[in-house]
């Protein structure tokens, strides 16, 4: 079964995923998707890396660890209840059926009615989007169909799996700035380099 992680509405959620590159800079493509890991790829892809860089991401989804060292943990910014569900981290190791895949269950709790005042970090300031407009997007649009989401009523609570989302804030401090180019001129929520 999936390992369970938690965050509160309005916080950032942290979903850990790691691998060990064969050599420094010798990266393996990784994808993150909403929904359990299918046989290939990652359900509805929200972020992916190639052998060099993060080449596709969507709004609110970030890699804040050092992905060049194999830390491909996902941060989801400012979560809502709709972010609950299963997420797939897939390490796409070349070869015959070599992929490693991990299903992580994210449980979002309603925000406390009277939260203690906390300092909100400026996520955009910490990780500015370095955007250019290199206009070659996908040659055709794929309709994203309905993919597996977990029903909130089915989610069990595992107290020992609690992940304080403030930990994710601390981890961000050592993260690398992610640069990308926007290929969707009319959609600020999707950013990617083409993968060729």
């Amino acid at each position: 079964s999936e390992v369970e992680y938690r965050a509160e509405v309005g916080q950032n959620a942290y979903l850990p995923c790691f691998y060990t590159p064969a050599a420094p800079g010798n990266l393996v493509p990784v994808c993150w998707g909403k929904g359990a890991c299918p046989v290939f790829e990652c359900g509805n892809v929200v972020l992916r890396t190639d052998e060099r860089d993060v080449n596709y991401w969507t709004s609110r989804y970030w890699l804040n660890g050092d992905f060049r060292k194999g830390d491909v943990s996902l941060t989801i910014e400012n979560v809502t209840l709709a972010d609950s569900g299963i997420y797939c981290c897939r390490i796409q190791i070349p070869g015959i059926m070599n992929d490693e895949k991990f299903n992580l269950k994210l449980v979002i709790k309603p925000a406390k009615v009277t939260p203690a005042p906390t300092r909100q970090r400026d996520f955009t300031a910490a990780f500015p989007r370095m955007l250019t407009t290199r206009g070659h997007g996908p040659a055709e649009t794929q309709t994203l169909g309905s993919l597996p989401d977990i029903n909130l009523t089915q989610i069990s609570t595992l107290a020992n799996e609690l992940r304080d989302s403030r930990l994710a804030n601390d981890l961000r401090d050592s993260g690398a700035t992610i640069r990308g180019s926007s290929d969707y001129k009319d959609d600020d929520d999707k950013h990617h380099h083409h993968h060729h």
């Epitope: 046989v39 290939f40 359900g43 070349p94 794929q142 169909g145 309905s146």
Partner: antibody, heavy 122, light 107 residues
Framework: EVQLVESGGGLVQPGGSLRLSCAAS????????MAWVRQAPGKGLEWVAN????????YYLDSLKSRFTISRDNAKNSLYLQMNSLRAEDTAVYYC???????????????WGQGTLVTVSS | DIQMTQSPSSLSASVGDRVTITCRAS??????LAWYQQKPGKAPKLLVY???TLAEGVPSRFSGSGSGTDFTLTISSLQPEDFATYYC?????????FGQGTKLEIK
């Protein structure tokens, strides 16, 4: 219009080899996983193999991976299946199919070729 | 391997009938299920993917439902061109596997 056209089928003796080809057009070939699926005469569908966008990752039916090799040439928009040590039970129509794309989402073989018949017999 | 079991194996129905074909997976496949229609001598045609999303160009009389292990394909009002063999297929575990097929015949 998306088109997949298989070729290379035919009659081959047991123990022989064949190389099937699939020519793709009408879409960005390198944006999609591709697959081979086969169907023995009067039988159901059986998945054979898949390959990722650039050919670096391949996936096989366990019983076939020592004899069959899937590959692709994105510059030629072509998919291949090298079949060695063929057996009578490999007799089937072999279909080339387009699988999931670069952004995920659509899990199903959306487009199929017309198929090419491979007959293994002495 | 994940086994896909379709029922019934064959079915006789009349034009205008409502028909339901079921597919059961031996393990949880979430919603990674596709349905295909195949006519004799032709390649299969994708009808539904991700359990309930209708493929492009497929008439709205076809619908898919289910998740986890139990899935259904429903044809709300059979048309003459719908008589064919139908297959389900899972895209969750390796190897990819198909159901054995359901042959839909004219009564």
């Amino acid at each position: 219009e998306v088109q997949l056209v298989e070729s290379g089928g035919g009659l081959v003796q047991p123990g022989g080899s064949l190389r099937l080809s699939c020519a793709a057009s009408g879409f960005t070939f390198s944006d999609y996983y591709m697959a081979w699926v086969r169907q023995a005469p009067g039988k159901g569908l059986e998945w054979v193999a898949n390959i990722n966008y650039d050919g670096s990752s391949t996936y096989y039916l366990d019983s076939l991976k020592s004899r069959f090799t899937i590959s692709r040439d994105n510059a030629k928009n072509s998919l291949y299946l090298q079949m060695n040590s063929l057996r009578a039970e490999d007799t089937a129509v072999y279909y080339c199919a387009r699988d999931v794309g670069y952004y995920g989402g659509n899990y199903g073989f959306a487009y199929w070729g017309q198929g090419t018949l491979v007959t293994v017999s002495s | 391997d994940i086994q896909m079991t379709q029922s019934p194996s064959s079915l006789s129905a009349s034009v205008g009938d409502r028909v339901t074909i079921t597919c059961r997976a031996s393990d949880n496949i979430y919603s990674y299920l596709a349905w295909y229609q195949q006519k004799p001598g032709k390649a299969p045609k994708l009808l539904v993917y991700n359990a309930k999303t209708l493929a492009e160009g497929v008439p709205s009389r076809f619908s898919g439902s289910g998740s986890g292990t139990d899935f259904t394909l429903t044809i709300s009002s059979l048309q003459p061109e719908d008589f064919a063999t139908y297959y389900c297929q899972q895209h969750y575990g390796s190897p990819l596997t198909f159901g054995q097929g359901t042959k839909l015949e004219i009564k």
